[in-house]
Amino acid sequence: LGCDLPQNHGLLSRNTLVLLHQMRRISPFLCLKDRRDFRFPQEMVKGSQLQKAHVMSVLHEMLQQIFSLFHTERSSAAWNMTLLDQLHTGLHQQLQHLETCLLQVVGEGESAGAISSPALTLRRYFQGIRVYLKEKKYSDCAWEVVRMEIMKSLFLSTNMQERLRSKDRDLGSS
């Protein structure tokens, strides 16, 4: 696999968002009072100076953490198993591709700091999500809030990926 974050990776990311959307089990209108500020680290995905290593590291850690979050007994009890299996498969495919790419990028000499720093930040963010679910006793509304939060953060991360791709296109055409 080449490591130009090909079109099919973008498609897989969009497919993950579609699956997360389809997983909805209860009306979010019932869950207003359960909203929580998870403090998604926006600065990580909003910068204009995007390094390939940084983007891939953010996407890899995001997908790894989403995979872990939705790969638990609690999660299996909360969601439709067919959709959950599809989500696991899609995430696994994306992770495999990104792991190949990360090895190549590190081999090309991009700094390890660009890779380890986002990972730590994202782990803290997802830890906050896990604490929230536990506090809320894994209620339907808590899972619904988390589902929408994950959709938002994945959407922002995917946008970052699109920005890198268009930057690469611009460089390639100049």
């Epitope: 959307h21 909805r24 869950c31 207003l32 009072k33 909203r35 998870f38 939060e149 938002k152 959407f155």
Partner: antibody, heavy 121, light 107 residues
Framework: EVQLVQSGAEVKKPGESLKISCKGS????????IGWVRQMPGKGLEWMGI????????AYSPSFQGQVTISADKSISTAYLQWSSLKASDTAMYYC??????????????WGQGTLVTVSS | DIQMTQSPSSLSASVGDRVTITCRAS??????LNWYQQKPGKAPKLLIY???SLQSGVPSRFSGSGSGTDFTLTISSLQPEDFATYYC?????????FGQGTKVEIK
């Protein structure tokens, strides 16, 4: 730039039907809910209901349930408020506003300019 | 439904005055309380969200406080453009409800 643009003022007769619109631009339309708020002449703000444009799920205030219908067409980033049979008491300014759903972000941070509906025989 | 009660209904003040408007909810709404400003013929404008967070672009003379059932909007030094009607609104649960409004007039 985020914008909600509402359709123009309407003058109707009692018993007539009406559908007003609210078109969103400058943001991901399906990532936010759209709420509708009524303001009768010289009065305060009343929340009517809300829609999630991603799947057209709706919630209404008990005061407006059965009186109006809220809908959305995500393909054209537009939400609607409609009446099947208008009454003189429906005369008011109607506003749409976007809501972040379950995400931790400001409620009703952007509003349409309002649509004045006048119902008179 | 959660009732929102604002006080006073109207007040007269001068430029430079410190103005305080209160809002009381009929049950605890945590910090799910927003404040809006509305000028005649215009759409409402969000000032404060989640009880105390200042909306982007809103002058720092506006501040909000409170939690549970009692909330306050403060304008530290009233400016000519602040003469308007102010509404509180709870977003703790549906149906969303607004206070009846507080009209701030020139003394």
């Amino acid at each position: 730039e985020v914008q909600l643009v509402q359709s123009g003022a309407e003058v109707k007769k009692p018993g007539e039907s009406l559908k007003i619109s609210c078109k969103g631009s400058g943001y991901s339309f399906t990532s936010y809910w759209i709420g509708w708020v009524r303001q009768m002449p010289g009065k305060g703000l009343e929340w009517m209901g809300i829609i999630d444009p991603s799947d057209s799920d709706t919630a209404y205030s008990p005061s407006f349930q059965g009186q109006v219908t809220i809908s959305a067409d995500k393909s054209i980033s537009t939400a609607y408020l409609q009446w099947s049979s208008l009454k003189a008491s429906d005369t008011a300014m109607y506003y749409c506003a976007r809501h972040p759903g379950l995400n931790w972000a400001p409620d009703f941070d952007y509003w349409g300019q309002g649509t004045l509906v006048t119902v008179s025989s | 439904d959660i009732q929102m009660t604002q006080s006073p209904s109207s007040l007269s003040a001068s430029v430079g005055d410190r103005v305080t408007i209160t809002c009381r909810a009929s049950q605890s709404i945590s910090k799910f309380l927003n404040w809006y400003q509305q000028k005649p013929g215009k759409a409402p404008k969000l000032l404060i969200y989640f009880a105390s967070s200042l909306q982007s672009g809103v002058p720092s003379r506006f501040s909000g406080s409170g939690s549970g059932t009692d909330f306050t909007l403060t304008i530290s030094s009233l400016q000519p453009e602040d003469f308007a009607t102010y509404y509180c609104q709870q977003s703790y649960d549906f149906p969303i409800t607004f206070g009846q409004g507080t009209k701030v007039e020139i003394k």
